[in-house]
């Protein structure tokens, strides 16, 4: 924003001098921290979002902005109050140099303090196609319904609402919050101003090129003509759709964040708010041929985080980078030359590519989704849109080695009826962060809130792990891997599925003494297994022979090394029925799996026995995969020996409830 | 730099209002700070009278909250004073203020 | 109200001399911060009053660091080490703590 006063340039002017600030926050015993973007040429020093406590009134935040002001006063420091946040988050946005950043972490009430930094455009027929099941032609695409009951929110460059693909299906709001553009002569041109956010608006609800024809919707301008925004003001953004919805509740609410920069803890706290509060965010993974969780909003855990793929299921490749991958994308979708509204004239078109694209695919499904069940959750509609997608088709060998197996290999499909999923028992897999190679170090993968954890698993590239465990934290179950001594570090697998009205435990059965290893049942009546995990202390579990097998007539059982404790988890839920089902391979192999009939849905994956050489255990899809380290490097056969176990269930009370309502 | 300059009539008569001005340059109003009325006695006591935030909250001296008011014209960048039923004890100099910077003050004499 | 007692009400100095100015507050300038706002400030004759010092022992930017504050809790003092010509006025303290915002009665100082 341009300063209408001169009264800045004191302070640009210490800016300029001054180094580069805090990197970290004061040894001042203050619990407040501040925080900066990673990526250098995209900080913007000078501007701070000040974050504070979750339950401060407006009123507090004002004075405490006012307190902040009149101690930099006093320091002979100008500072300007930008916002005042309420809504989502409270806090301000504050106009002051980094040496007062020491200062601003001791106020009171203060949680964080972010420097603010610069967000990007995510762009550079065969796309409905590709969503388009099979029963339908894509030239005659005629979605089952259009999404005219959602409303969706597109936050993103100014936009041409008159092209004849658009007009009348969005509403311009009058939101503005754009820095200034870079370079003296840079030619504000309106075609070039509207391009982006014309061209999305196409793909999620044009007359000819859109994927939900019948969605309405409504524009914030939070990128400048050259396609950049800040965090700040998509922040405000998000604060001004949070306003709206309180003012005038509508139906369900989907909001289109095309746009990413770096990893960003007060953007991703401000898309958490918003998901909380009933609102659908679909984000754009990113363009930097890189780890989608270290931009932002893409690694925010609420938001629907879509990669990018082109006709042939490829990962895009954009110039010298392409797509981002890894564990915090979601889904793909169609992302290369995908053609949509022109703003060069109100009747052209042109093909533009980019996760940006593909974004706007999954908002324009998931309008379409809540259209015709607008009652469903986010929890809900994620777990949909997973279900539904066209499954290992992307050509994983395009990812980083690391990063194949953290990258959900599925592209986004309409349902083939947007009715009648309700009797599914819908389970995705989640993956935690790397715990990292210290010795202690563990990894925390969580489910959303109104998931259930059905089981944990861990996988070590370096098969130098301790196992997994579930348990509880804040009221709600986790799952923990944890870290070796040598280990390059572990992740942690959670298994996370609808499942209403479940009441769920975990049974834990220390160390058995005796030679035939350790074993652990659901006791209670009337709950199933649901997953199995076993967590050591010992360095390096030893092989156990013979190997350690379930009896049978036995399912609600829990089987594993006599050295580690083994973790049942045992759930009671309406109409949930359970059975094991395993995969035995005698011959050492890399590989071992064990995949779920149809109908059932994998709640557990589990490996037996669990001795060192097995890497891990995860699912994929209604697989369980078992890894082992390479065949060349295993000793005897019987020491490769593997077994994939697999829990697989189904839930009647949904499948008979499903009936009742067709 | 920012500055403050105070404005209105150096003379009012008793039990009428007495109303001020504080035109601020170098800074807009609506992007921080408390911007406040002070007042200095002829001996030498200061009062603290109030202020309005940049957010257009106010803030009163308990002693003179029935008869203060602060209000501000964003489009002018000023910020105004007006005292009501006004007696020969409210004869001060007058200034506004954005602690910890003042205006030059103004004299006003309460007297019929 | 915060009422704070400054003494002395008169003092006389000779140039070059020391001398110091008492502030006791009724009650503890400790914010919940852990500052104690409170400031030291002097009007010059014809002149608004300038900042001093702040949060009790700062001194404002360009004043001499013959201007010492010190004090804690509900007792300050504003020591001048050695005075010169351009030293005379009346020293306010002044609390920022609590609301309303107070001043102390003054000090005026003058050169023998």
């Known amino acids: 924003q341009e300063d209408e006063d001169g009264d800045y340039e004191e302070l640009v002017l210490a800016l300029r001098s001054e180094e580069d600030g805090l990197a970290e926050a004061p040894e001042h015993g203050t619990t407040a921290t501040f925080h900066r973007c990673a990526k250098d040429p995209w900080r913007l020093p000078g501007t701070y979002v000040v974050v504070l406590k979750e339950e401060t009134h407006l009123s507090q935040s004002e004075r405490t902005a006012r307190r902040l002001q009149a101690q930099a006063a006093r320091r002979g420091y100008l500072t300007k109050i930008l916002h005042v946040f309420h809504g989502l988050l409270p806090g301000f946005l504050v106009k002051m140099s980094g040496d007062l950043l020491e200062l601003a972490l001791k106020l009171p009430h203060v949680d964080y303090i972010e420097e603010d930094s610069s967000v990007f455009a995510q762009s550079i027929p065969w796309n409905l196609e590709r969503i388009t099941p099979p029963r339908y032609r894509a030239d005659e695409y005629q979605p089952p319904d259009g999404g005219s009951l959602v409303e969706v929110y597109l936050l993103d460059t100014s936009i041409q609402s008159d092209h004849r693909e658009i007009e009348g299906r969005v509403m311009v709001t009058d939101f503005e919050n754009v820095p200034e553009e870079d370079g003296t002569r840079f030619h504000r041109q309106a075609s070039k101003c509207d391009s982006h956010g014309t061209h999305l608006a196409g793909v999620v609800s044009g007359r000819d090129a859109g994927v939900a024809k019948g969605a309405s919707m409504r524009s914030l301008r939070v990128l400048n003509c050259q396609g950049k925004g800040t965090v700040s003001g998509t922040l405000i953004g998000l604060e001004f759709i949070r306003k709206s919805q309180l003012v005038q509740p509508v139906g369900p609410l989907v909001v289109l964040l095309p746009l990413a920069g770096g990893y960003s803890r007060v953007l991703n706290a401000a898309c958490q708010r918003l998901a909380r509060a009933g609102v659908v965010l679909v984000t754009a993974a990113g363009n930097f041929r890189d780890d989608a969780c270290l931009y932002s909003p893409a690694s925010a855990p609420e938001v629907i985080t879509v990669g990018a793929t082109n006709a042939q299921d490829q990962p895009v490749t954009l110039g010298t980078l392409g797509t981002n991958f890894g564990r915090c994308v979601d889904l793909f979708a169609p992302g290369e030359d995908i053609i949509g509204a022109s703003s060069d004239c109100s009747t052209c078109f042109v093909s533009q590519s980019g996760t940006s694209q593909a974004a706007a695919h999954v908002a324009g499904i998931a309008a379409m989704m809540l259209s015709a069940e607008p009652e469903l959750t986010l929890a809900e509609l994620r777990q949909r849109l997973i279900h539904f997608s066209a499954k290992d088709v992307i050509n994983e060998a395009w990812f980083p080695e690391d990063q194949r197996v953290l990258t959900p290999n599925l592209v986004a499909a309409l349902p083939p009826s947007t009715h009648g999923a309700g009797w599914q028992l819908f389970c995705r897999t989640v993956w935690s962060a790397h715990s990292g190679p210290t010795r202690m170090a563990t990894a925390v993968a969580r489910c959303a809130p109104d998931e259930e954890l059905l089981s944990c698993s861990s996988f070590s590239r370096s098969g130098k792990r301790r196992g997994e465990r579930m348990e509880a934290q804040g009221g709600k179950l986790v799952c923990r891997a944890h870290n070796a001594f040598g280990g390059e570090g572990v992740y942690a697998i959670a298994r996370c599925c609808l499942l209403p009205q479940a009441n769920c435990s975990v049974h834990t059965a220390p160390p058995a003494e005796a030679s035939m290893g350790t074993r652990v049942h659901c006791h209670q009546q009337g709950h199933v297994l649901t997953g199995c995990s076993s967590h050591w202390e010992v360095e390096d579990l030893g092989t156990h022979k013979p190997p350690v097998l379930r009896p049978r007539g036995q399912p609600n059982q829990c089987v594993g090394h006599r050295e580690a404790s083994i973790h049942a988890s045992c759930c009671h839920a309406p109409g949930l029925e359970c059975k094991v089902k395993e995969h035995g391979i005698p011959a050492p192999q890399e590989q071992v799996t064990v995949a779920c009939e149809e109908g059932w849905t994998l709640t557990g994956c589990s490996a037996l026995p669990g001795t060192s050489h097995v890497l891990g255990a995860y699912a994929v899809d209604n697989t369980c995969v078992v890894r082992s380290r390479d065949v060349s490097t295993t000793g005897s056969t019987s020491e490769g020996a593997v077994t994939a176990v697999a829990i697989c269930c189904r839930s009647r009370h949904l499948a008979q409830a499903s009936q009742e309502l067709q | 730099e920012v500055q403050l300059q105070e404005s209105g009539p150096g003379l009012v008569k008793p039990s009428q209002s007495l109303s001020l001005t504080c035109s601020v340059t170098?800074?807009?109003?609506?992007?921080?700070?408390?911007w406040s009325w002070i007042r200095r006695f002829p001996g030498n006591t200061m009062e603290w009278m109030g202020d309005i935030s940049y957010s257009g909250s106010t803030n009163y001296n308990p002693s003179l909250k029935s008869r203060v008011s602060i209000t501000r014209d964003t489009s002018k960048n000023q910020f105004f004073l007006q005292l009501n039923s006004v007696t020969t004890g409210d004869t001060a100099t007058y200034y506004c203020?954005?602690?910890?910077?003042w205006g030059q003050g103004t004299l006003v004499t309460v007297s019929s | 109200d915060v009422v704070l007692t400054q003494t002395p009400v008169f003092l006389s100095v000779t140039l070059g001399d020391q001398t110091s100015i008492s502030c006791r507050s009724s009650q503890s300038l400790e914010y919940s911060d852990g500052y104690t706002y409170l400031e030291w400030y002097l009007q010059k004759p014809g002149q608004s009053p300038q900042l001093l010092i702040y949060e009790v022992s700062n001194r404002f930017s360009g004043v001499p660091d013959r201007f010492i504050g010190s004090g804690s809790g509900t007792d300050f003092t504003l020591k001048i080490s050695r005075v010169e010509p351009e030293d005379l006025g009346v020293y306010y303290c002044?609390?920022?703590?609590?609301?309303?915002?107070?001043f102390g009665s003054g000090t005026k100082l003058e050169i023998k």
């Open positions: 170098g800074y807009t109003i609506t992007s921080g700070y408390d």
């Open positions: 002044f609390q920022g703590t609590h609301d309303p915002l107070t």
């Open positions: 203020a954005k602690l910890p910077g």
